[in-house]
């Protein structure tokens, strides 16, 4: 159950997909990846106020308990709900190979 | 790829399973659940330092970019890797029913 998509904190403040440009050096990949030289990393960033994009029952519980015990139970967290695959051209012992990673780029986001 | 399980912040400080006792009132369930009266909610709480229990490649990227741009990219977050099902005895219009929820109690945790 994905709950409300209305952000009470104002536009763009709640959990959503962001794109961050990163070089191979930024990612610590320069020694094992040849291409791409730069990655448009899509990731989930933003606040998870009460019931906003709640991923499941667990997220709803977490929201309730965070309201009661904010020092003990953290608020739900903005994380990927699914991923887009990406191919990397990797260095190998003998040359290069193509490797597709299914869990590299966030496709959409929810709170959990 | 689940990376290191050694917590550099000290015992129990990093992402792990915690149990929080909660009443139906705490959870906001009193009007639709009969049993259990109290739930031992297992949830994922704790810090996600570099590569600790990294769920996947995306988590590793997030760690690298958080180190570079801490104000823009948040650290990975401690969330359930899997769930334990739980049955609730629910009130219905005509009486009660049993309903199993697969996404209510965290079973184990990782950082993402």
């Amino acid at each position: 159950a994905r709950n409300g998509d209305h952000c009470p904190l104002g536009p763009g403040r709640c959990c959503r997909l962001h794109t961050v440009r990163a070089s191979l050096e930024d990612l610590g990949w320069a020694d094992w990846v040849l291409s791409p030289r730069e990655v448009q990393v899509t990731m989930c960033i933003g606040a998870c106020p009460s019931q906003f994009r709640a991923a499941n029952m667990h997220a709803q519980i977490k929201t309730s308990l965070h309201r009661l015990k904010p020092d003990t139970v953290p608020a739900p967290c903005c994380v990927p709900a699914s991923y887009n695959p990406m191919v990397l051209i990797q260095k190998t012992d003998t040359g290069v190979s193509l490797q597709t990673y299914d869990d590299l780029l966030a496709k959409d986001c929810h709170c959990i | 790829a689940r990376n290191g399980d050694h917590c550099p912040l000290g015992p129990g400080r990093c992402c792990r399973l915690h149990t929080v006792r909660a009443s139906l009132e705490d959870l906001g369930w009193a009007d639709w659940v009969l049993s259990p009266r109290e739930v031992q909610v297992t949830m994922c709480i704790g810090a996600c330092p570099s590569q600790f229990r990294a769920a996947n490649m995306h988590a590793q990227i997030k760690t690298s970019l958080h180190r570079l741009k801490p104000d823009t990219v948040p650290a990975p977050c401690c969330v359930p890797a899997s769930y334990n099902p739980m049955v609730l005895i629910q009130k219905t219009d005509t009486g009660v029913s049993l309903q199993t929820y697969d996404d209510l109690l965290a079973k184990d945790c990782h950082c993402i």
């Epitope: 791409p36 695959p85 990406m86 990397l88 290069v96 780029l105 | -």
Partner: antibody
């Protein structure tokens, strides 16, 4: 494994439009970094890149031929089409469909021969 | 556009020989160069990526080097199956190929 299969008319008349189709398997064009391109080789000559289409629907064309080329994709069928308008005898060639990974022509189809003649 | 000039255009050699093919770019292309092998009646096959990295399954006798404008493909000890045409290609801007080097049995 990656497979690319070109299909075309074999013979086209001058001034007509050449339509080619590439059917591919073993990879997804929705994967970031993937693309499919077309390269041709006139008889006894070298290789010439024509066009390619990328995972994000970006299309690139050889500037010398851009006004005559159209590339498109049908992701549901794993097919790429190329149209070359106003053909002449100089367009007689083997046309290859190629899988791209980022900027690399990683895998090539067997090619389809196209002759332009009246 | 960036021109890629290969030399020689054809070359005769014997099994066991060491062979070097060169490719010169009309402007700096960094290491954005690939090499392909084409046997008669077949489609080209990827050999080298990023100037010096062998594609999967390519024997170690093939090696590439260079950066900027000058690139080489070396076959350290020719095997019978290596007689073919070789093409360099740059991908620094829109892709262009060299005219090819035909490697024949002496």
């Amino acid at each position: 494994q990656v497979q690319l299969q070109e299909s075309g008319p074999g013979l086209v008349k001058p001034s007509e439009t050449l339509s080619l189709t590439c059917t591919f398997s073993g990879f997804s064009l929705s994967t970031s970094g993937m693309g499919v391109g077309w390269i041709r080789q006139p008889p006894g000559k070298g290789l010439e890149w024509l066009a390619h289409i990328l995972w994000d629907d970006v299309k690139r064309y050889n500037p010398a031929l851009k006004s005559r080329l159209t590339i498109s994709k049908d992701s549901s069928k794993s097919q790429i089409s190329l149209k070359l308008s106003s053909v002449t005898a100089a367009d007689t060639a083997v046309y290859y469909c190629v899988q791209m990974a980022w900027d690399w022509f990683a895998y090539w189809g067997q090619g389809t021969t196209v002759t332009v003649s009246s | 556009d960036i021109q890629m000039t290969q030399s020689p255009s054809s070359l005769s050699a014997s099994v066991g020989d060491r062979v070097t093919i060169t490719c010169k770019a009309s402007q700096n292309v960094d290491t954005n160069v690939a090499w392909y092998q084409q046997k008669p009646g077949q489609s080209p096959k990827a050999l080298i990526y990023s100037a010096s990295y062998r594609s999967s399954g390519v024997p170690s006798r093939f090696s590439g080097s260079g950066s900027g404008t000058d690139f080489t493909l070396t076959i350290s000890s020719l095997q019978p199956e290596d007689f073919a045409t070789y093409y360099c290609q740059q991908y620094h801007s829109y892709p262009t190929f060299g005219q090819g080097t035909r490697l024949e049995i002496k």
